[in-house]
C-alpha cells in the first residue's frame, strides 16, 4: 500500500547489525509522487566498492547508489549524511552483511518522503504534445484553439475524422488546405461507393505538399490509400509521387493523413470518381458473345451461344446457350457454364447388326452400323454410316436420324442343292 | 418327294416343317411363313420348326420351333365342311405370322418373293426346286429333307392325269390361272406331307438368288405331274396383309 | 410293314460281356435312329443311348458310360448293343427301339433281349 | 442327365376315378415330355408326345399338360383297363431320361 513518508533502520538499529544479514524494503509513494530518501545515521563497515557490506538503493532497473562507511552530515543545521531523491513512486532499498565485522557497526538510518515531481520539465520527454500543465501529484495536457485533446491524453489532434463519401464524384482535400495542415494529426477518410463501382482517385502533382521523407526515406508526414488488401501509398513530398489516375478495384477506400510535430505544409487536395466495376473480357472457347464490346463493366449482360456442335453441360442438358451478368465483384455470372462438344452418347443397337465401340461419341465423331452377313442387309441404304451431329443425334447422310434396318437376306441357300443321281 | 434326293436344310433354309398335319412352308421374312390354304385351314395354331434337315424328334427338339400369333387364309379360298372331298383348290394361299422374329442363319432364311413385272411370268421347261419330308417311294414319310428340280409344263399335262383315288367325278376338278403344272419328268414330284413348300425358281434379275414362284397344293396322282399355287398372282395380296399385321417396329 | 427282331436270351457270367443284336426289316437302317432301353426285373425302363446319323456319333447315358458300345452294319441293316464288365445288377431285357418323328420318341419296339447276369 | 422325378410311385384307385400323376423334370424340357403305359411282360406302349399331343388309338380319357418343369398326366375316368405302370420321358436333350414310374392299382 503506498505511503506518503517512513523510516527504514538496519537490523537491531541503534545497536550493532549482525553478520550475514541480507535485508530489502520496497518502498512505494502514490502515483504522480518523486520519492526523496535521506540517511540520517551512516555506520557500515567499510571496503573497496562497499563489497563485504553495504546499503544498496536501486530504482527500477538502475542502482541509484551504494554506500558504506561513516558518513556525517556536512551541515551543521541538518542532520542528513546522505540523500537520493528519483522521479519515480518506486524504490527498493537492500541491505547486506557479510560473514564477519572486524568492529562494532551499528548501521543506518534512513527517512523517505513523497515528493511533488514537475512532469512537465524533469523528464527528457515532454509529456504533452502542445501545453504542459503540473500539479502536486500530477500533470494535464491542454491544446491551442481547434485542437483536441486525443483520447492518450497527452497528443492534440484537429477533428479530421470520420467522414464518409458516398456520392459517386467528390473531392476531398487535408484540413485548412491550401493553409498548412495542422501537426500531429490522423485523419481518416472513407469512400463508400455502392457494390459494382471502382473508386478511382485523380490526383494533379501541383495539388500534393506534404513534408518530406528522412533520410532513410521514411514519409514524417504521409498519405496512404487502403482498398481492401491492397495499399496505395505512403505518399509525401513536394508534388505527387504516385499515379496520377488510381484506380483501386474496389467500392470501398481509406484516405489516412498521418502528420508529426513540426514541418507543416500546404498539404493535399485529390477527386475521385466512381467507376463501374470492369469484368475482363473472358476467354470463353467454342462460343460468340452477343454484344461483342472491346469493354464491358458491371450489369453489362451477355448472351454466351455455342458454336454448332457445343453445347452448355451443367443441369440444363442440351443448352446451346446462357446468359452472364458482369458482377459487382468484377467477376462474370454463370462463369463456370462452358461450350462442350455435344455428346450423342453410345449409339443405339439394331436388330440384326451391329456398331463398333465408338472411341468417341462427341461431336464430329463417326461411327458404322453393318448388318450379320451374309444373312442380313441394310435395307434402308445410307450405307450405314453416321457422324455426330451438333443436335446430338448420331446422324446418317440419306437417312438422317433414322437408324439402319438389318432385313433378311432373301433367296440365297448355304450350299446349292446337287441332286444326287439315283 | 418322290423321285428326289436327299437334301441338307442348308440347301434350302426357308423351308419350314410342319408337323400337324404334316406338311411345309417357305419362310418369307422374319414374321411371315407362307404355305397352302389347305394346311393351316384345319388347324390355325399349327407347330412350325425350321433349320433342321430331320424331322426326328431328336432333331426337332435341338431345332428353332415357331409360334403362330396368326393365320391368314386368302378370302378366295373355300371352306369345306368335309375338306377331304375337296376338288377345289383355287386361291390355295396362307400366311402365318409369327409371334416372335426368326433368327436367320446358315440353316434358316427366307426366300424371295416374286417381282410384279413379266419377268418372273414362267414359261414351260422353266426349272424349280421342291422340297419337303412328304411321301416317297419308300416311306409315308421322309426322316431326311428330300429335294427334286422339275420343269413348269403345261397346265393341260397336269388335266390329263388321271386322278389316282378320286373323291368325285374327274370334270369336277378345278383347274385355274392361279396355279402351275410343273413336272412330268423321271417321275419326280411333289406328294402328301409336302404341301405349302416351296416351287423355287432362280431369280431371273439375280441369279443367286431363289424366289417362290409356287406352292406345292394339289396333284392327281404323286410322280406323275403336280399343281402348285402361283405367288406371283398373290404378291398383292401377302404384301398387304403383312402391312397391315405388322408392328411399328417393323415398318 | 416295318419290324425289329432282336437276338435270343443270354445267360452271362459277373465280368463278361453280352452283344445284344437288332434286325430292321421293312426299312433301312441308315433312315432310323436305333435306341436302347433296358428294364430290369420289377424295375423301371433306363435309356442306354442311340446312335446320332446326322451327327455321326453314338451317344450314351452317363450312367453306361465307358462299359456301353452301340454298333450298325448298314449292309445288314442291323444294329448292335454290347455291355461289358457285367454285374448281376445288368440281370434286364433290353429292348432296341427306332426313333419317332415330329415329337413322338419311341416308334417302334423290338421283342427285348433277356440278359441274365449270374455266378 | 436330366433327372426325371414322377409321383407318386403308388397310386390306388378305383373304376371311374379321376387319376394324376405328376412329373418334375430337373431343368426346363420346354414341351418335350411323352407318357408311356406298360403291362407287365409287354413293350411300353405311347400314349401322350409333346406333352399333350395324343398319339393316334389312344383313347381320349388320357390327357398331358405342362411345360419346362412341371407335367401331369391325367386319365379322367380310370377304366379296368388302365391298371399299368406309367412312365414319362424326355427328349429334349440328347441324353433320354425316364422318370421311376406310377403304379396305378386297384384299390
Known amino acids: 500500500e503506498p505511503t506518503m513518508y517512513g523510516e527504514i533502520l538496519s537490523p537491531n538499529y541503534p545497536q550493532a547489525y549482525p553478520s550475514e544479514v541480507e535485508k530489502s524494503w520496497d518502498i512505494e509513494v502514490p502515483e504522480g509522487y518523486g520519492i526523496h530518501l535521506y540517511f540520517t545515521h551512516l555506520d557500515i563497515e567499510l571496503s573497496e566498492n562497499c563489497a563485504y557490506d553495504s546499503v544498496q538503493i536501486i530504482s527500477g532497473d538502475t542502482e541509484e547508489g551504494r554506500l558504506c562507511g561513516q558518513r556525517s552530515s556536512n551541515n551543521p543545521h541538518s542532520p542528513i549524511v546522505e540523500e537520493f531523491q528519483v522521479p519515480y513512486n518506486k524504490l527498493q532499498v537492500i541491505f547486506k552483511s557479510d560473514f564477519s565485522n572486524e568492529e562494532r557497526f551499528t548501521g543506518f538510518a534512513a527517512y523517505y518522503v513523497a515528493t511533488d515531481i514537475n512532469e512537465c520539465t524533469d523528464f527528457v520527454d515532454v509529456p504533452c504534445s502542445h501545453f504542459c500543465n503540473n500539479f502536486i501529484g500530477g500533470y494535464f495536457c491542454s491544446c491551442p484553439p481547434e485542437y483536441f485533446l486525443h483520447d492518450d491524453m497527452k497528443n492534440c489532434g484537429v477533428n479530421c475524422s470520420g467522414d464518409v463519401f458516398t456520392a459517386l464524384i467528390g473531392e476531398i482535400a487535408s484540413p485548412n488546405y491550401p493553409k498548412p495542415y495542422p501537426e500531429n494529426s490522423r485523419c481518416e477518410y472513407q469512400i463508400r461507393l455502392e457494390k459494382g463501382f471502382q473508386v478511382v482517385v485523380t490526383l494533379r502533382r501541383e495539388d500534393f505538399d506534404v513534408e518530406a521523407a528522412d533520410s532513410a526515406g521514411n514519409c514524417l508526414d504521409s498519405l496512404v490509400f487502403v482498398a481492401g488488401d491492397r495499399q496505395f501509398g505512403p505518399y509525401c513530398g513536394h508534388g505527387f509521387p504516385g499515379p496520377l489516375n488510381i484506380e483501386t478495384k474496389s467500392n470501398a477506400l481509406d484516405i489516412i493523413f498521418q502528420t508529426d510535430l513540426t514541418g507543416q505544409k500546404k498539404g493535399w487536395k485529390l477527386r475521385y470518381h466512381g467507376d463501374p466495376m470492369p469484368c475482363p473480357k473472358e476467354d470463353t472457347p467454342n462460343s460468340v458473345w452477343e454484344p461483342a464490346k472491346a469493354k464491358y463493366v458491371f450489369r453489362d449482360v451477355v448472351q454466351i451461344t455455342c458454336l454448332d456442335g457445343f453445347e452448355v453441360v451443367e443441369g440444363r442438358v442440351g443448352a446451346t446457350s446462357f446468359y452472364s451478368t458482369c458482377q459487382s465483384n468484377g467477376k462474370w455470372s454463370n462463369s463456370k457454364l462452358k461450350c462442350q462438344p455435344v455428346d450423342c452418347g453410345i449409339p443405339e443397337s439394331i436388330e440384326n447388326g451391329k456398331v463398333e465401340d465408338p472411341e468417341s461419341t462427341l461431336f464430329g465423331s463417326v461411327i458404322r452400323y453393318t448388318c450379320e452377313e451374309p444373312y442380313y442387309y441394310m435395307e434402308n441404304g445410307g450405307g450405314g454410316e453416321y457422324h455426330c451431329a451438333g443436335n446430338g443425334s448420331w446422324v446418317n447422310e440419306v437417312l438422317g436420324p433414322e437408324l439402319p434396318k438389318c432385313v433378311p437376306v432373301c433367296g440365297v441357300p448355304r450350299e446349292p442343292f446337287e441332286e444326287k443321281q439315283r | 418327294i418322290i423321285g428326289g434326293s436327299d437334301a441338307d436344310i442348308k440347301n434350302f433354309p426357308w423351308q419350314v416343317f410342319f408337323d400337324n398335319p404334316w406338311a411345309g412352308g417357305a419362310l418369307i421374312n422374319e414374321y411371315w411363313v407362307l404355305t397352302a390354304a389347305h394346311v393351316v385351314e384345319g388347324n390355325r395354331e399349327p407347330t412350325m420348326y425350321v433349320g433342321s434337315t430331320s424331322v426326328q424328334t431328336s432333331r426337332l427338339a435341338k431345332s428353332k420351333m415357331l409360334t403362330p400369333e396368326h393365320v391368314f387364309i386368302h378370302p378366295g379360298w373355300k371352306l369345306l365342311e368335309v375338306p377331304e372331298g375337296r376338288t377345289n383348290f383355287d386361291n390355295d394361299i396362307a400366311l402365318v405370322r409369327l409371334k416372335d422374329p426368326v433368327k436367320m442363319g446358315p440353316t434358316v432364311s427366307p426366300i424371295c418373293l416374286p417381282g410384279t413385272s413379266s419377268d418372273y411370268n414362267l414359261m414351260d421347261g422353266d426349272l424349280g426346286l421342291i422340297s419337303g419330308w412328304g411321301r416317297t417311294e419308300k416311306r409315308d414319310r421322309a426322316v431326311r429333307l428330300k429335294a427334286a428340280r422339275l420343269p413348269v409344263a403345261p397346265l393341260r399335262k397336269c388335266k390329263e392325269v388321271k386322278v389316282e383315288k378320286p373323291t368325285a367325278d374327274a370334270e369336277a376338278y378345278v383347274f385355274t390361272p392361279n396355279m402351275i403344272c410343273a413336272g412330268g419328268e423321271k417321275g419326280m414330284d411333289s406328294c402328301k406331307g409336302d404341301s405349302g413348300g416351296a416351287f423355287a425358281v432362280q431369280d431371273p434379275n439375280d441369279k443367286t438368288k431363289f424366289y417362290a414362284a409356287g406352292l406345292v397344293s394339289w396333284g392327281p396322282q404323286c410322280g406323275t405331274y403336280g399343281l402348285y399355287t402361283r405367288v406371283k398372282n398373290y404378291v398383292d395380296w401377302i404384301m398387304k396383309t403383312m402391312q397391315e399385321n405388322s408392328t411399328p417396329r417393323e415398318d | 410293314e416295318v419290324q425289329l427282331v432282336q437276338s435270343g436270351a443270354e445267360v452271362k457270367k459277373p465280368g463278361a460281356s453280352v452283344k445284344v443284336s437288332c434286325k430292321v426289316s421293312?426299312?433301312?437302317?441308315?433312315?432310323?435312329?436305333m435306341h436302347w432301353v433296358r428294364q430290369a426285373p420289377g424295375k423301371g425302363l433306363e435309356w442306354m443311348g442311340t446312335?446320332?446319323?446326322?451327327?455321326?456319333?453314338?451317344i450314351y447315358a452317363q450312367k453306361f458310360q465307358g462299359r456301353v458300345t452301340m454298333t450298325e452294319d448298314t449292309s445288314t441293316d442291323t444294329a448292335y448293343m454290347e455291355l461289358s464288365s457285367l454285374r448281376s445288377e445288368d440281370t434286364a431285357v433290353y429292348y432296341c427301339?427306332?426313333?419317332?418323328?415330329?415329337?413322338?420318341?419311341?416308334?417302334?419296339w423290338g421283342q427285348g433281349t433277356l440278359v441274365t447276369v449270374s455266378s | 442327365d436330366i433327372q426325371m422325378t414322377q409321383s407318386p410311385s403308388t397310386l390306388s384307385a378305383s373304376v371311374g376315378d379321376r387319376v394324376t400323376i405328376t412329373c418334375r423334370a430337373s431343368?426346363?424340357?420346354?414341351?418335350?415330355l411323352a407318357w408311356y403305359q406298360q403291362k407287365p411282360g409287354k413293350a411300353p406302349k405311347l400314349l401322350i408326345y409333346?406333352?399333350?399331343s395324343l398319339e393316334s388309338g389312344v383313347p381320349s380319357r388320357f390327357s398331358g399338360s405342362g411345360s419346362g418343369t412341371e407335367f401331369t398326366l391325367t386319365i379322367s375316368s380310370l377304366q379296368p383297363d388302365d391298371f399299368a405302370t406309367y412312365y414319362c420321358?424326355?427328349?429334349?436333350?440328347?441324353?433320354?431320361?425316364f422318370g421311376q414310374g406310377t403304379k396305378v392299382e386297384i384299390k
Open positions: 427301339v427306332t426313333e419317332g418323328l415330329a415329337g413322338v420318341p419311341f416308334d417302334l
Open positions: 421293312g426299312d433301312t437302317l441308315t433312315e432310323l435312329s
Open positions: 446312335f446320332d446319323p446326322e451327327e455321326g456319333e453314338t
Open positions: 431343368q426346363s424340357i420346354s414341351s418335350w
Open positions: 409333346k406333352a399333350s
Open positions: 420321358q424326355q427328349h429334349n436333350s440328347y441324353r433320354w431320361t
